[in-house]
Structures are given as structure tokens and as C-alpha cells.
């Protein structure tokens, strides 16, 4: 079965920059990656970013940068421009459309404990759908 | 079949605002990711910015920021942008698109005049 | 700001002749992490809305005639039309989908004899 690993990552530079990594364990090609805050997509989820592989990357504040790691993995820049770092506590969704798959998505966050630098284990919490 | 129907064309004078709307039909509107491009007479095409639908999170080319402003209405399934102080370099058709500009609206002209 | 440079301005061709046309970038639109190109090329017809012809360099939107043929990578693209018919009359203009601002060259005008 297809598997959407994610994790979340503090740099230890900048405590306030994190970087989100997700990808796609499994047969077929990916048509479209969603990156979400708050909750997975179409369920409370705020839209961060959308990357297709030919079309080109698209990502909305506080997302900085959404690239291709691989042509199953992405990343999410994020700049947290407030005093407090409400990042720390937020879950992030990635959902990958694949063909002839259908939908697969996962979600993750930075766990309390984390050290700046260290991320978070690929631990995915699956919400598995065929759209 | 993804459609983007735009406000029909404007004269305004100098110095005024004007608020040009895109309204898409033919899928969930929350999917709409909507761009926003300047075509000034006879010549290329100038990216101005884009929202994301379900939050107004938007991006803005640098040369439109003060200038231009977008917000989406999702009762009504519309996207407007508004330009203010605008003067006859304004002058332009200006158009929606979806957002990789694989389905674009037929373009509302602005025309700036005293 | 990525610089799009498109050449020649115009051309005129006679019907079923083979066009070739350029768009350079001042940065190159490669993504190493899955080596795709972030280049569109767009046909706008005379009062009409531009259409999207090709994306990711090469490949053909759904419906785009087979005539019309994407290439090249990093910073050096072509668009070729192989047999140029009438309808194709039109401007061509080549875009940056690879960052933030999205940029526009100044496209080329293809006339037919």
C-alpha cells in the first residue's frame, strides 16, 4: 500500500524558520502535492502550498519556499514572523494525488521535546482515501 | 469546464479606484487558485499576483504592491482585484486565471481618462 | 526578478513552412530535486485571452495540436511549430513557472504570408 511520510523540522539557526519534508512511498506518478496547516485538506486545513511536478511549485504566507526534493519528495520553507512560535504546536498535512492511486495523505508535527535541528520521526498518521 | 466570466469594461478618472471582479464556475471554488495579469495596449503580459481562496492568503509582484489589491469572496464564488490612484499607465486589459494559468477569463479593459 | 528574452520579435512564414522560436532566461528554470523545467509557452490570438500550449518545457497541453513541439532546458528554450497553418497567427510568448514574480517575455508575432 502507498505511504505519505512527513516531518517536521526546526532549524537550528533560526528558531523561528521550520522546514516541513513529505513524501510518497509507493507505486505511480504523482499529479499534485497539497501542503496544509492546522488539520489535513478540505477539512480544516489551511491551504500552504501546491507543487506540481510540471506546472511549477505555488505557496502562500508563512510558507517561503515549496520545492522538489525528489520526484517523490518535496519541502516546505516556513517563516513564523510572530514573537511566539506557533509552529511548534501545529500539525502539517501533505496529500499526494498519484495515478492511478487516487489520494494519499498524512499529517505531522514538531514534537514537544525537540531540540532546534533535530526533526520529527517518520511516524505518518495516515488518512488513506481513493478520491 | 473550468469557466472564469469577468466584470465588463471600465473608464475611470485619474486618481480614482476601481474594483475588477472574476467569477469561476465548473468546479468547487475552493479549488480556484486565482492569478492576475496586466496586458497594457499591444504589449506583454505582466504578472500581478495571486490569492489562495480558502484563507486570501495572496502573493504580490513587488511592482503591483500599493497598487493592487486582491480578495476573494467564497459566497459568491468570485475573486476581485482593486487598483487605486490610478493613473493612464493603469490603462490595460487586465485578466484572471486559474492557477497555472491553464484556464483564463475573456479580460475586462480599464480605461483611465479625465 | 527572472529576465525572459524572447527572439525573433516577429517572423512571417507561408503556410506548412517549419517556425522555430527562442526564449532565453536570465536564471536557470531546472528543479535539480526532479529535474523538471518550470517553462510555459502561451499562444494569444488577436482579441482573445492567452491559452496555455505547453508547460513544463515539452509537454503539450491536452488538446494542443501535435504540430507544436516544446524543448530545451536550464536556460535556453524553443517552441517549434512543424507545419504552420493558418490559425496559427497569433503571438507566443514564453513564462516563468519557476519562481516568485511569475515573468513574461515579450513574445513573438507570427504572421502568415
Known amino acids: 500500500t502507498p505511504e505519505v511520510w512527513v516531518q517536521v523540522q526546526m532549524e537550528a539557526t533560526e528558531l523561528s524558520s521550520f522546514t516541513v519534508h513529505c513524501g510518497f512511498l509507493g507505486p505511480g506518478s504523482i499529479s499534485l502535492v497539497t501542503v496544509s496547516w492546522g488539520g489535513p485538506d478540505g477539512a480544516g486545513g489551511t491551504k500552504l502550498a501546491v507543487l506540481h511536478p510540471e506546472l511549477g511549485t505555488r505557496q502562500w504566507a508563512p510558507a517561503r519556499q515549496a520545492r522538489w526534493e525528489t520526484q517523490s519528495s518535496i519541502s516546505l520553507a516556513l517563516e513564523d514572523s510572530g514573537a511566539s512560535s506557533p509552529f511548534a504546536n501545529t500539525t502539517f498535512c501533505c496529500k499526494f494525488a498519484s495515478f492511478p492511486e487516487g489520494s494519499w495523505e498524512s499529517c505531522g508535527s514538531l514534537p514537544p521535546s525537540s531540540d532546534p535541528g533535530l526533526s520529527a520521526p517518520p511516524t505518518p498518521v495516515p488518512i488513506l482515501r481513493a478520491d | 469546464e473550468v469557466q472564469l466570466q469577468q466584470s465588463g469594461p471600465e473608464l475611470v478618472k485619474p486618481g480614482a479606484s476601481v474594483k475588477i471582479s472574476c467569477k469561476a464556475s465548473?468546479?468547487?471554488?475552493?479549488?480556484?487558485?486565482i492569478n492576475w495579469v496586466k496586458q497594457s495596449h499591444g504589449k506583454s503580459l505582466e504578472w500581478i499576483g495571486d490569492i489562495e481562496p480558502n484563507n486570501g492568503g495572496t502573493n504580490y509582484n513587488q511592482k503591483f504592491k500599493g497598487k493592487a489589491t486582491l480578495t476573494v469572496d467564497k459566497s459568491s464564488s468570485t475573486a476581485y482585484m482593486e487598483l487605486r490612484s490610478l493613473t493612464s499607465e493603469d490603462s490595460a486589459i487586465y485578466y484572471c486565471?486559474?492557477?497555472?494559468?491553464?484556464?483564463w477569463g475573456q479580460g475586462t479593459t480599464l480605461t483611465v481618462s479625465s | 526578478d527572472i529576465v525572459m528574452t524572447q527572439s525573433p520579435s516577429s517572423l512571417s512564414v507561408s503556410a506548412g513552412e517549419k517556425v522555430t522560436m527562442s526564449c532565453k532566461s536570465s536564471?536557470?528554470?531546472?528543479?535539480?530535486?526532479?529535474?523538471?523545467?518550470?517553462l510555459a509557452w502561451y499562444q494569444q490570438k488577436p482579441g482573445q485571452p492567452p491559452k496555455l500550449l505547453i508547460y513544463g518545457a515539452s509537454t503539450r497541453e491536452s488538446g494542443v495540436p501535435d504540430r507544436f513541439t516544446g524543448s530545451g532546458s536550464g536556460t535556453d528554450f524553443t517552441l517549434t511549430i512543424s507545419s504552420v497553418q493558418a490559425e496559427d497567427l497569433a503571438v507566443y510568448y514564453c513564462q516563468n513557472d519557476h519562481s516568485y514574480p511569475f515573468t513574461f517575455g515579450s513574445g513573438t508575432k507570427l504572421e502568415i504570408k
Open positions: 486565471a486559474t492557477l497555472y494559468f491553464d484556464y
Open positions: 536564471q536557470s528554470l531546472l528543479n535539480s530535486g526532479n529535474q523538471k523545467n518550470y
Open positions: 465548473g468546479n468547487t471554488f475552493t479549488d480556484y487558485y
